[in-house]
Amino acid sequence: LNTTVLQGMAGQSLRVSCTYDALKHWGRRKAWCRQLGEEGPCQRVVSTHGVWLLAFLKKRNGSTVIADDTLAGTVTITLKNLQAGDAGLYQCQSLRGREAEVLQKVLVEVLEDPLDD
């Protein structure tokens, strides 16, 4: 899987869209996780609603929000009030029981506002 690089400005919001085959992943919840090291585990940040039919509802963990358009096949993650510590490698995942399939790898880069001292 290729890694998508996304850049966001510190203090602002960054929106990530992961597309997938809606029929292939029908009924599966989605998750956003942060990769711990190159070969390390992916630590869950947030996942969609426990009831798949309600996956369109926004689910929040801290400053991270996830919602899934299961018909269009797009899961959207919003990282609000982006901080330098949010930079790193993430994954969009499709969940089946205890199994997680990687839909997309995303490298988040945080740019400092040049007007800030």
């Epitope: 085959d21 029929l23 292939k24 992943h25 029908w26 009924g27 599966r28 919840r29 996942s47 426990g50 009831v51 798949w52 969940l95 089946r96 029981g97 205890r98 199994e99």
Partner: antibody, heavy 118, light 113 residues
């Protein structure tokens, strides 16, 4: 009407190669997962692996990884299970089954009996 | 791999009575996040392919009579067949799909007394 029609019985010798097939009809073949399940004579069911014909994404049970190859040709709505070198222990009934993305199986083929004997 | 253990191996039943088949998993099949229990039941009638009876612990598959019901939690599961009929004979299998590889129980053969 959803149907999975499997190829006929096969009698082979050890070391020979074989490919059996499962043709889907009555639904969008590309859009459903398709699994293979083995049943050795007088025994229970064993999940071998599964394929999504839309993009050929394939998962194998570790017990069957490297022993068989699962493939699909969506242009003719057919999935395949193949061996490059059969063993006597491959003698079994093999079923294909249409699965949901959550991997439960709602439609099954009639089975293909493979006999491997010298 | 998750090991699925079924009991009894064989179950002779009288038509009209209730039959119960047990299935035990070596690990919990409950996903605590979505509340689902990833346990299914299949029936293989003599000389036929398997057919889905129950999925996700207790949901009856299309066309399955309400005489069939699934229950349980965590690692212990039961398939109940009420008012057993002659056409219910065959081998019943439980299957877990919470993780790969998917694994089946050894089967319970239901026969008419």
């Amino acid at each position: 009407e959803v149907q999975l029609v499997q190829s006929g019985s096969e009698v082979k010798k050890p070391g020979e190669s074989l490919r059996i097939s499962c043709k889907g009809s009555g639904y969008s073949f590309s859009s459903y997962w398709l699994a293979w399940v083995r049943q050795m004579p007088g025994k229970g069911l064993e999940w071998m692996g599964i394929i999504y014909p839309g993009d050929s994404d394939t998962r194998y049970s570790p017990s069957f990884q490297g022993q068989v190859t699962i493939s699909a040709d969506k242009s003719i709505s057919t999935a395949y299970l193949q061996w490059s070198s059969l063993k006597a222990s491959d003698t079994a009934m093999y079923y294909c089954a249409r699965g949901t993305p959550l991997f439960y199986f709602t439609y099954w083929g009639q089975g293909t009996l493979v006999t491997v004997s010298s | 791999d998750i090991v699925m253990t079924q009991t009894p191996l064989s179950l002779p039943v009288t038509p009209g009575e209730t039959a119960s088949i047990s299935c035990r998993s070596s690990q919990s099949l409950l996903d605590s996040e979505d509340g689902n229990t990833y346990l299914d039941w299949y029936l293989q009638k003599p000389g036929q392919s398997p057919q889905l009876l129950i999925y996700t612990l207790s949901y009856r598959a299309s066309g399955v009579p309400d005489r069939f019901s699934g229950s349980g939690s965590g690692t212990d599961f039961t398939l109940k067949i009420s008012r057993v009929e002659a056409e219910d004979v065959g081998v019943y299998y439980c299957m877990q799909r919470i993780e790969s590889p998917l694994t089946f129980g050894g089967g319970t053969k239901v026969e008419i007394k």
